[in-house]
């Protein structure tokens, strides 16, 4: 079945082109040889001009970008929303963990509260900063918490007869905290639990944010001129022959898209691996690898660590009395 | 053992949590996210097919356009002729991905490496050292409220792990996504949708 003869007046082509580019007189009145065309190479007279061809190419690339954006819309929404929800949820967990820990101090060790609240607050601020990607070392965070707590525990609970603490004794007590391992293995235990759970949490959030970046990159891809020419030939060149209602062949479309998307499709292998690796990570996020579990239980572990200090109070007070005698003498003067 | 900080439950939001019908933990939300993401596992390989199915393509017509002429839909010419004497499609593929795509591939490689190193091997969730330090003491089943604490006498059950997500101000169901709906379909490796794209012929 031969193709229908082209529109003798180019009227149909004109009215369609008018929708793309209102008011421009680029469409020939009647079919022309079209020897200047570079994409829609004519087999006979054509209703297209070089200017029209350029406009078609622009429109084709724009259409392609819109199609790509609509393709990724649901996926993009899924990751963006979840990244936001998890970030907020993690902040809520941190806030509750802080409140739990403060409540533990208030209910069990009221004499420590003003200073303990400050140290606990700083510790959980660091936890938040770490989750959001700051370069803090978890061991340093935990050490700092116990370094700060011990002088207060010693001067308020174990040796309350001391005069108002001055820097000297506090500094000696900070040193003694590590040298004498006054909290036993609790700091180490907390370091292990907190670092494992926070590392996993942080990488989980990082992965979600990278997912957003991947989709955004795909979303805003600019297609090459070659691709623009292929798309124009597929979607618009038929109009030049007055074939307004005809559609591209399916197989042809697939070949063109494979060509245009050759680069993008290369992401596929790594994208699959990304989802499967994320799944593996999520499957392992429980017990000490689950920050919700670990942080909400910190108040209990910190409580146990203070009980450990109290249990060894007598022995510690004697040792510290000798170790920090110099600082104490200076204080009494 | 530690005084359980009940007095914290004055937060109205948390009071609300206790009465949530469909309770969710962070871990259930994570698993739900993974299931949804897995339906997009073929997203990139399915893109060319997706775009063809969402731009005008001859489906029921006998004749279709192959880039040069009108041909019968099932003829050899339907896919081939439009490419002849135009420009080399192979050349286009040989150029390789543009820098921005290469960059994103590098970032994916990096995060995949990180994710793999961070993934917990099955059955090794508890380190030996932690086990010895009493992390596992106390009798807590996996399906019950998780046990939290480090030593026997300090063990506390945190009631149902707070169900934090009920507290969040917005709901996250993708069904409520703005715009048109679209679903990844794993079975046929194709993404289907109901968008209309502007400016299409």
């Amino acid at each position: 079945q031969p193709p229908p003869p082209p529109d003798a007046t180019c009227h149909q082509v004109r009215s369609f082109f008018q929708r793309l580019q209102p008011g421009l007189k680029w469409v020939p009145e009647t079919p022309v040889p079209g020897s200047d065309l570079q994409v829609c190479l004519p087999k006979g007279p054509t209703c297209c001009s070089r200017k029209m061809e350029e406009k078609y190419q622009l429109t084709a690339r724009l259409n392609m970008e819109q199609l790509l954006q609509s393709a990724s819309m649901e996926l993009k929404f899924l990751i963006i929303q979840n990244a936001a929800v998890f970030q907020e949820a993690f902040e809520i967990v941190v806030r509750h963990a802080k409140n739990y820990t403060n409540a533990m101090f208030k209910n069990n060790y009221p004499s420590l509260t003003p200073q303990a609240f400050e140290f606990v607050g700083e510790f959980f601020t660091d936890v938040s900063l770490y989750i959001l990607g700051s370069d803090i070392n978890v061991d340093d965070m935990v050490n700092e918490l116990f370094d700060s707590l011990f002088p207060v525990i010693y001067t308020q609970m174990m040796n309350p007869g001391l005069p108002e603490s001055v820097l000297d004794i506090n500094e000696c007590l900070r040193g003694a905290r590590r040298d004498l391992k006054v909290f036993g293995s609790f700091p180490k235990l907390i370091m292990t639990q907190v670092s494992k759970s926070l590392q996993v949490t942080r990488i989980f959030l990082q992965a979600l944010n990278l997912g957003i970046e991947v989709i955004n990159t795909t979303d805003h891809l600019k297609f090459s001129k070659d691709c623009g020419r292929m798309l124009t030939r597929m979607w618009y060149c038929s109009y030049c022959q007055g074939l307004m209602m005809v559609k591209p062949c399916g197989g042809y479309c697939n070949v063109v898209m494979q060509g245009c998307m050759a680069g993008v499709v290369e992401i596929d292998k790594y994208w699959r691996e990304y989802i499967l690796s994320l799944e593996e990570l999520v499957n392992g996020m429980y017990r000490i690898y689950d920050m919700e579990n670990v942080l909400l239980g910190l108040f209990s572990t910190i409580h146990d660590s203070i009980q450990y200090v109290q249990k060894n109070g007598g022995k510690l007070t004697t040792t510290i009395g000798k170790l920090c005698a110099h600082s104490q003498q200076r204080q009494y003067r | 053992s530690a005084y359980y900080p009940e007095d914290l439950f004055i937060d109205k939001k948390i009071l609300k949590v206790a009465h949530v019908e469909h309770e969710e933990t962070l871990s259930s939300r994570r698993r739900e996210l993974i299931q949804k993401l897995k339906s997009f596992i073929n997203f990139y390989s399915a893109l060319p097919g997706y775009i063809c199915s969402h731009s005008p393509v001859a489906e029921n017509d006998t004749l279709c356009w192959n880039g040069q002429e009108l041909v019968e839909r099932y003829s050899q010419k339907a896919a081939r002729n439009g490419m002849k004497n135009q420009f080399n499609l192979h050349e286009l593929k040989m150029k390789g991905p543009e820098p921005v795509v290469s960059q994103i591939i590098d970032k994916l490689k990096h995060i995949n490496q990180l994710l793999r190193t961070m993934s917990v091997p099955k059955g090794k969730v508890l380190d030996k050292s932690l086990d010895e330090e009493g992390l596992e003491s106390g009798d807590c089943g996996d399906d019950e409220d998780e046990c939290i604490g480090s030593s026997g006498d300090g063990m506390v059950k945190v009631k149902n792990q707070l169900r934090f997500l009920a507290e969040l101000a917005y709901d996250l169901d993708v069904d409520d996504a703005p715009g048109n709906k679209q679903h990844g379909n794993q079975k046929d490796n194709e993404i289907t949708t109901s968008h209309s794209v502007g400016n299409m012929p």
């Epitope: 370069d135 803090i136 050490n143 700092e144 370094d147 | -």
Partner: antibody, heavy 121, light 111 residues
């Protein structure tokens, strides 16, 4: 008495290297983050670098990244700043400062008296 | 990393009050990060006046107070005294935990 004493400053030609030291006393050095801050003649304070209590985390200003290296020896209670590829704009009084926190930068609550570094040909 | 913004100078008569502002961004003064204030006399090392937005170290007179709101912080000196004439610097840290100082404000006590 809490004290910080810088040393190692002096006149140096552009492109050359210099190593500053800061001896700490009167406090538990290994418990605190430490900093180097500089002040060019007649100018404001410019933070240079910091290191966490354990030395595991280090931080640098953009202007010195890749040229300067901060380190500490907790057994000797000493902080160091290795300055390579020095430029005229590195001329300043370099202060060593102790942070009130251990894990990262917060507030600098003890300062040394400073050591002058002059980079000139 | 860019410096925090402070006015170059401020002045007041003895007994009056002076407030110095310090403006940053959501990644330094805003967010989780704390603001500190320092006093520096010519040829001397700086001295910490305020930490954690509003806390005074021991030995700092209560005439000095600090506050923070959003991405701005301020230092207030009430009952200005002659010895308060000095340079004042605000300081915070950014999301990469790098320290950032303000450009400094010269406070002059008049009369």
């Amino acid at each position: 008495q809490v004290q910080l004493q810088e040393s190692g400053g002096g006149l140096v030609q552009p492109g050359r290297s210099l190593r500053l030291s800061c001896a700490a006393s009167g406090f538990t050095f290994s418990s605190y983050a430490m900093h180097w801050v500089r002040q060019a003649p007649g100018k404001g304070l410019e933070w240079v670098s910091a290191i966490s209590s354990s030395g595991r985390s280090t931080y640098y200003a953009d202007s010195v990244e890749g040229r300067f290296t901060i380190s500490r020896d907790n057994s000797k209670n000493t902080l160091y700043l290795q300055m390579n590829s020095l430029r005229a704009e590195d001329t300043a009084v370099y202060y060593c400062a102790k942070d009130r926190r251990g894990s990262h930068a917060d507030a600098l609550n003890v300062w040394g008296q400073g050591t002058l570094v002059t980079v000139s040909s | 990393q860019s410096a925090l913004t402070q006015p170059p100078s401020a002045s007041g008569s003895p007994g009056q009050s002076v407030t110095i502002s310090c403006t940053g961004t959501s990644s330094d003064v805003g967010g989780y990060n704390y603001v500190s204030w320092y006093q520096q006399y010519p040829g001397k090392a700086p001295k910490l006046l305020i930490y954690g937005n509003s806390n005074r170290p021991s030995g700092v007179p209560d005439r000095f107070s600090g506050s923070k709101s959003g991405t701005s912080a301020s230092l207030a000196i009430t009952g200005l005294q002659a010895e308060d004439g000095a340079d004042y610097y605000c300081q915070s840290y950014d999301s990469s935990l790098r320290v950032v100082f303000g450009g400094g404000t010269k406070v002059t006590v008049l009369g």
